[in-house]
């Protein structure tokens, strides 16, 4: 297993609709044709998997149907979007990239993107 550098933004603020997007960029040592991307959430020193997708280079990322993630790839960049976020989902979201093919196997883990989610204030009752 060889190490690989993965870059991602330090901080992202989710939209009022609970959507956060960030770019995960990896320094591929060669031309990888099968890549696995995983988003992990670290909060209170606990790590959980948020979503994962394996894609063949040139094809779209395919997450499971019930995944809260969507994404697109372009070269060595993956544009990730996480939906349905609430304030309690605030945490460090780590991008992990694995180059499965061709060999050798490479693993890269980013430093994480701190995603802040602020629940919108409820609209005040209106007399109109």
């Amino acid at each position: 297993c060889k190490a690989m550098h993965v870059a991602q933004p330090a901080v992202v603020l989710a939209s009022s609709r609970g959507i956060a997007s960030f770019v995960c960029e990896y320094a591929s040592p060669g031309k990888a044709t099968e890549v696995r991307v995983t988003v992990l959430r670290q909060a209170d020193s606990q790590v959980t998997e948020v979503c994962a997708a394996t894609y063949m280079m040139g094809n779209e990322l395919t997450f499971l149907d019930d995944s809260i993630c969507t994404g697109t790839s372009s070269g060595n960049q993956v544009n990730l979007t996480i939906q349905g976020l609430r304030a309690m989902d605030t945490g460090l979201y780590i991008c992990k990239v694995e180059l499965m093919y061709p060999p050798p196997y490479y693993l890269g883990i980013g430093n994480g993107t701190q995603i802040y989610v602020i629940d919108p204030e409820p609209c005040p009752d209106s007399d109109f």
């Epitope: 297993c1 696995r36 992990l40 790590v47 992990k96 694995e98 499965m100 093919y101 693993l107 883990i109």
Partner: nanobody, 119 residues
Framework: EVQLVESGGGLVQPGESLRLSCAAS????????MAWYRQAPGKQRELVAR???????NYVDSVQGRFTISRDNAKNTVYLQMNSLKPEDTAVYYC?????????????YGQGTQVTVSS
């Protein structure tokens, strides 16, 4: 605990076939690059064949066209179909799983199964 259990080894004559199987823990199989390595007496362990989760395969030149690696994700099992066996294929064959789980990388090997090709 992750376990890789190989089976299917044995003694065969040159030109015959064998199929090796390796059953893996469900928790890692579908996300692992699965491979077969072999080690002959007095030699270094060498990669024979590998298969990715997406089904991409690689073979060492000496087995190309004779060996076929495949995986059954429903059974968490990887296979090595070995045809036209030669005496130089004699070795202990090891199943390998490589990948990462959460933030930890892993590189597991099974106990090995002996393949002997002799007349």
């Amino acid at each position: 605990e992750v376990q890789l259990v190989e089976s299917g080894g044995g003694l065969v004559q040159p030109g015959e076939s064998l199929r090796l199987s390796c059953a893996a823990s469900k928790s890692i199989f579908s996300i692992s690059v699965m491979a077969w390595y072999r080690q002959a007496p007095g030699k270094q362990r060498e990669l024979v064949a590998r298969i990715t989760p997406g089904g991409n395969t690689n073979y060492v030149d000496s087995v190309q066209g004779r060996f076929t690696i495949s995986r059954d994700n429903a059974k968490n099992t990887v296979y090595l179909q070995m045809n036209s066996l030669k005496p130089e294929d004699t070795a202990v064959y090891y199943c390998n799983a490589q990948g990462s789980l959460l933030l930890a990388k892993y590189d597991y090997y099974g106990q090995g199964t002996q393949v002997t090709v002799s007349s």
